[in-house]
Interface confidence: low
C-alpha cells in the first residue's frame, strides 16, 4: 500500500490496533522490513507499507483526520471530500474525522445529503455499520451532539465555534463519498440547531447533547422540524432528568409558525404537544446549576409524524354550485381559553390553504380536508338568504328549508343553519309549515330533541325572538308579518340520525298586520305550553300576537295561565288580551295592566287568544305563559 498526503493538506492518517481479539497470531504493519503496530502519516508524507497477515481488518483500524482552520484564513466550504480516496486505503475499518475550528461568532452548518441521518442512543449500533459522530465545542470543552446512522430525518446540524465530525466506515463498506457539506452561517447564538426533515410519515428519536450524560449548563439547543402540511407531528418525551437549578428554569419551548402564543413554554414533565400541522421548532433551555449538587439535565424524545387520524385525511367535496346566497363557515367551537398548548386544528381548501376558519360560498364546488386531532373541536355555521323582491312573482311560492345532504355528510358537527327570509315591506308576509308539528321550548316542557328551530325577526331595529321550537308538539304553523331568520340549531351529534325529522316549508303569503300567528292543534291528553315571544325580555312595545287553537268536536280544551297578574305596567296605551270563540265570535277582553288573569277556562270549540302590548315602563314587561289541555267531552267537567 502507498499513502501520499499532499503538503499543507492538514491531514493525518493513523493506523493502529483495533479492539484486541483472541486471535492467536499477531499481525504487524511492515515498513522497510520493520514490524510496527502503529503508523502515523502526516501532511506532505508518502509511505509504502504492507501487513504481515492475510486479514489485517481483523487487527487494525485506520483514522484519517483533517484539521480545518477557519480562524486564520478562509474556510473551504462546500462538499467535503474523502481524502485520501477510499480506493487508495487498505481495507480496514476506517474513521474519517474532520475537525473544524472557527471563531465564536461564526456559525457552521453540516448539510447531509440523502439519505439523511438517524440519531442513535447509547448501546445502539447502525445496521450497515456506518456511523456519524458529531461533537461541538464550548470554549475548550468538547460537547457530544450525537451519534447518527443513515436513513433518518436529520438534514442539517448548525453549530458555533467549531465542529468535529467522525464518519466511521466498516472495512467492507463501498462508500466513497462523505455525504455531507459544510457551509458558513451567521452566529446561531446557541449550542446547536438540528434540522429534521420528514418527507412523509415516520418517526425520529432525538437526544440532548452529551446524552446520556448531562446537557451543558445554561445552554440552549434547538431542533427544527420540517413537516409536510398534510401530515401531523406529535412530540413525546421518552426519558428525561432535571438538574438542580439555582437560577432560571429548565424548560422546552415550541415555536409554531402561525401560532399567536409563540413561543409555547413547557416544563419537561408536562404533556408535550401533539397533532401539529406543518413545521415547528423545539428548544431545550438549561439553567444555572447548583454548584454543590448540580444533578444532570438530559432529554430523549420522539417526534411522530403521521397522517391525520380517523377520517380527517380524506378529501370532502362540498357542492354549493347549485346554491345561491349561501355561505358555510367551519370554525373552532368556543372554548375556555387556557394557557396550555392546544394542537392546531385546521380546515384546508384544496388540501393546500389551511386555516382555523374557512368560509365557503355558493356557486362553486369546494374540496376540503382537515388537519385536526379531534374534529369535535370544530363546528359548522351556515347562512342562506331567501328573498323575494317582486311580490307578484313570489306570492304563494314555497321553499323547503332543508339542510343539504352534502353538508350533513361532512365529519364536522353542524351547529347552526340559518335561513334569512326577506319579503317586500307591507306587501307580503311569511308562513312556516313544519313537516312534523312543533313544540315550543319552555322551562316547564323543555325540548329534548337533537335540534330546534330558533325563529327571530331579521329586521335590524326590531328585537323580537319568537322562540325555540322542536319537532313533536302541537304547533302546526307559524305566520309572521315580515323578515325573519329561522335557525336550525343542533344540540347533539345524534342530529345526523334525526335529520329526517327536519323539514320546514316557508311560503310567501298576503301581508297581515299582526307580528305573529301560531296555529295550534293540540293532541289529546297532552299539555301544550305556549309563551309570548321575547320571553324574559318582554313582548316588544305595541306588538300583537295571536294563537289560533283548534279544538276537535269530541274534545274540550282547558286554557290555563300560570300567573295571577301579567305584571306589565304601561307607560302609554293599554295592554289587553282577547279570548274569542271562533264559532260564535263571543269574546272576553282582559286589561293586562289592570285585571287579574282569567282562571282556567274550558272551550268546546276552536278559539283565538290575542295578546297586544302597550308601551311598558322599563322593568315591567309583558311575559305570559299558558297551557292548553284537551280532554274528551264525555267526562263530567263539573
Amino acid at each position: 500500500f502507498e499513502i501520499a498526503l499532499p503538503r499543507e493538506s492538514n491531514i493525518t492518517v493513523l493506523i493502529k490496533l483495533g479492539t484486541p481479539t483472541l486471535l492467536a497470531k499477531p499481525c504487524y504493519i511492515v515498513i522497510s522490513k520493520r514490524h510496527i503496530t502503529m503508523l502515523s502519516i502526516k501532511s506532505g508524507e508518502r509511505i509504502v507499507f504492507t501487513f504481515s497477515c492475510q486479514s489485517p481488518e481483523n487487527h487494525f483500524v485506520i483514522e484519517i483526520q483533517k484539521n480545518i482552520d477557519c480562524m486564520s484564513g478562509p474556510c473551504p466550504f462546500g462538499e467535503v471530500q474523502l481524502q485520501p480516496s477510499t480506493s487508495l486505503l487498505p481495507t480496514l475499518n476506517r474513521t474519517f474525522i474532520w475537525d473544524v475550528k472557527a471563531h465564536k461568532s461564526i456559525g457552521l452548518e453540516l448539510q447531509f445529503s440523502i439519505p439523511r441521518l438517524r440519531q442513535i442512543g447509547p448501546g445502539e449500533s447502525c445496521p450497515d455499520g456506518v456511523t456519524h459522530s458529531i461533537s461541538g465545542r464550548i470554549d475548550a470543552t468538547v460537547v457530544r451532539i450525537g451519534t447518527f446512522c443513515s436513513n433518518g430525518t436529520v438534514s442539517r446540524i448548525k453549530m458555533q465555534e467549531g465542529v468535529k465530525m467522525a464518519l466511521h466506515l466498516p472495512w467492507f463498506h463501498p462508500r466513497n463519498v462523505s455525504g455531507f457539506s459544510i457551509a458558513n452561517r451567521s452566529s446561531i447564538k446557541r449550542l446547536c440547531i438540528i434540522e429534521s426533515v420528514f418527507e412523509g410519515e415516520g418517526s425520529a428519536t432525538l437526544m440532548s447533547a452529551n446524552y446520556p450524560e448531562g446537557f451543558p449548563e445554561d445552554e440552549l439547543m434547538t431542533w427544527q422540524f420540517v413537516v409536510p402540511a398534510h401530515l401531523r407531528a406529535s412530540v413525546s418525551f421518552l426519558n428525561f432528568n432535571l438538574s438542580n437549578c439555582e437560577r432560571k428554569e429548565e424548560r422546552v419551548e415550541y415555536y409554531i409558525p402561525g401560532s399567536t402564543t409563540n413561543p409555547e413554554v413547557f416544563k419537561l414533565e408536562d404533556k408535550q404537544p401533539g397533532n401539529m400541522a406543518g413545521n415547528f421548532n423545539l428548544s431545550l433551555q438549561g439553567c444555572d446549576q447548583d454548584a454543590q449538587s448540580p444533578g444532570i439535565l438530559r432529554l430523549q424524545f420522539q417526534v411522530l409524524v403521521q397522517h391525520p387520524q380517523n377520517e380527517s385525511n380524506k378529501i370532502y367535496v362540498v357542492d354549493l354550485s347549485n346554491e345561491r346566497a349561501m355561505s358555510l363557515t367551519i370554525e373552532p367551537r368556543p372554548v375556555k381559553q387556557s394557557r396550555k398548548f392546544v394542537p392546531g386544528c385546521f380546515v384546508c381548501l384544496e388540501s393546500r390553504t389551511c386555516s382555523s376558519n374557512l368560509t365557503l360560498t355558493s356557486g362553486s364546488k369546494h374540496k376540503i380536508s382537515f388537519l385536526c386531532d379531534d374534529l369535535t373541536r370544530l363546528w359548522m355555521n351556515v347562512e342562506k338568504t331567501i328573498s323575494c323582491t317582486d311580490h307578484r312573482y313570489c306570492q304563494r311560492k314555497s321553499y323547503s328549508l332543508q339542510v343539504p345532504s352534502d353538508i350533513l355528510h361532512l365529519p364536522v358537527e353542524l351547529h347552526d343553519f340559518s335561513w334569512k327570509l326577506l319579503v317586500p315591506k307591507d306587501r307580503l308576509s311569511l308562513v312556516l309549515v313544519p313537516a312534523q308539528k312543533l313544540q315550543q321550548h319552555t322551562h316547564e316542557k323543555p325540548c329534548n330533541t337533537s335540534f330546534s328551530y330558533l325563529v327571530a325577526s331579521a329586521i335590524p331595529s326590531q328585537d323580537l325572538y319568537f322562540g325555540s321550537f322542536c319537532p313533536g308538539g302541537s304547533i302546526k304553523q307559524i305566520q309572521v308579518k315580515q323578515n325573519i331568520s329561522v335557525t336550525l340549531r343542533t344540540f347533539a351529534p345524534s342530529f345526523q340520525q334525526e335529520a329526517s325529522r327536519q323539514g320546514l316549508t316557508v311560503s310567501f303569503i298576503p301581508y297581515f298586520k299582526e307580528e305573529g300567528v301560531f296555529t295550534v292543534t293540540p293532541d289529546t291528553k297532552s299539555k301544550v305550553y305556549l309563551r309570548t315571544p321575547n320571553w324574559d325580555r318582554g313582548l316588544p312595545s305595541l306588538t300583537s300576537v295571536s294563537w289560533n287553537i283548534s279544538v276537535p268536536r269530541d274534545q274540550v280544551a282547558c286554557l290555563t295561565f300560570f300567573k295571577e297578574r301579567s305584571g306589565v305596567v304601561c307607560q302609554t296605551g293599554r295592554a289587553f288580551m282577547i279570548i274569542q270563540e271562533q264559532r260564535t265570535r263571543a269574546e272576553e277582553i282582559f286589561s293586562l295592566d289592570e285585571d287579574v288573569l282569567p282562571k282556567p277556562s274550558f272551550h268546546h270549540h276552536s278559539f283565538w287568544v290575542n295578546i297586544s302590548n302597550c308601551s311598558p315602563t322599563s322593568g315591567k314587561q309583558l311575559d305570559l305563559l299558558f297551557s292548553v289541555t284537551l280532554t274528551p267531552r264525555t267526562v263530567d267537567l263539573t
Epitope: 402561525g258 406543518g278 388540501s351 393546500r352
Partner: antibody, heavy 125, light 107 residues
Framework: EVKLVESGGGLVQPGGSLRLSCATS????????MEWVRQPPGKRLEWIAV??????????EYSASMKGRFIVSRDTSQSILYLQMNALRAEDTAIYYC????????????????WGQGTSVTVSS | DIVMTQSHKFMSTSVGDRVSITCKAS??????VAWYQQKPGQSPKLLIY???TRHTGVPDRFTGSGSGTDYTLTISSVQAEDLALYYC?????????FGGGTKLEIK
C-alpha cells in the same frame, strides 16, 4: 435533482395553435401542482394556469384572460405537462415557463420552487 | 385580480450595502407573498414565500418581512452575484399575480 424542460415554442401566425411540453424528472410528478407562467418581452410575469395534483384529480384552473383559448393537461405516465394554445394573438408573444408548485407547507400554494428554462413563443404574421 | 406594485423599477447599490425592495398589494394578502430573483437570461428562482420564510438553499442575507398590504425584501449585504431582477408575487388567491419587478444594479 428536480428538472423541468420546456419545448414546443416557435413562430406562429395570429389565429394559429401551438402545443408546449414540459418534461419533468427528479420528483413524483403526480404529487405536485404544476403551473404555466409567461413573461412577455419587457413585461411582468403572468400566471396562466394550474394543474392540481393527483389528490385533487388533476383539476385545472386558468387565468380569466386565457380561459377558453389555453388548455393545460398532463401525461402522468411520462411525467409531462402540456399547454395547448389556440387562437393565438400578437399579445401572446412571450417566454413560457412551466413551474412546480412545490412549497408544501400549510397556507402556501402558488409558490413556485422550480422553473424550467422557458420556451419562446412569437405570434406574428 | 390583486395588483402587486413595485414602486422602484431600478435600485442602485454597492457591494456590502443593505438594500430593501418594497412591494404593495392592492388588498390585504395575509402574508401570502413570495419573492423571486431572475438573473439575465435565466428563469426566476424562489427566494422567500409566506412573506418571511426563506426557501431551501437561499443565503441568509435575504430576508422577507411585512404584513397586510406592504412587503419588503431585504438583502443585508449585497454581493456582486445579487445583480438581478426581483419580483414579488401574491399567493393569497387565484390568480396569483406578480409585481412589475425591481432591477438591482451594482454601482
Amino acid at each position: 435533482e428536480v428538472k423541468l424542460v420546456e419545448s414546443g415554442g416557435g413562430l406562429v401566425q395570429p389565429g394559429g395553435s401551438l402545443r408546449l411540453s414540459c418534461a419533468t424528472s427528479g420528483f413524483t410528478f403526480s404529487d405536485f401542482y404544476m403551473e404555466w407562467v409567461r413573461q412577455p418581452p419587457g413585461k411582468r410575469l403572468e400566471w396562466i394556469a394550474v394543474s392540481r395534483d393527483k389528490t385533487n384529480d388533476y383539476t385545472t384552473e386558468y387565468s380569466a384572460s386565457m380561459k377558453g383559448r389555453f388548455i393545460v393537461s398532463r401525461d402522468t405516465s411520462q411525467s409531462i405537462l402540456y399547454l395547448q394554445m389556440n387562437a393565438l394573438r400578437a399579445e401572446d408573444t412571450a417566454i413560457y415557463y412551466c413551474a412546480r408548485d412545490g412549497v408544501y407547507y400549510y397556507g402556501s400554494s402558488y409558490t413556485l420552487d422550480y422553473w424550467g428554462q422557458g420556451t419562446s413563443v412569437t405570434v406574428s404574421s | 385580480d390583486i395588483v402587486m406594485t413595485q414602486s422602484h423599477k431600478f435600485m442602485s447599490t454597492s457591494v456590502g450595502d443593505r438594500v430593501s425592495i418594497t412591494c404593495k398589494a392592492s388588498q390585504d394578502v395575509s402574508s401570502s407573498v413570495a419573492w423571486y430573483q431572475q438573473k439575465p437570461g435565466q428563469s426566476p428562482k424562489l427566494l422567500i414565500y409566506w412573506a418571511s420564510t426563506r426557501h431551501t438553499g437561499v443565503p441568509d442575507r435575504f430576508t422577507g418581512s411585512g404584513s397586510g398590504t406592504d412587503y419588503t425584501l431585504t438583502i443585508s449585504s449585497v454581493q456582486a452575484e445579487d445583480l438581478a431582477l426581483y419580483y414579488c408575487q401574491q399567493h393569497y388567491n387565484t390568480p396569483p399575480t406578480f409585481g412589475g419587478g425591481t432591477k438591482l444594479e451594482i454601482k
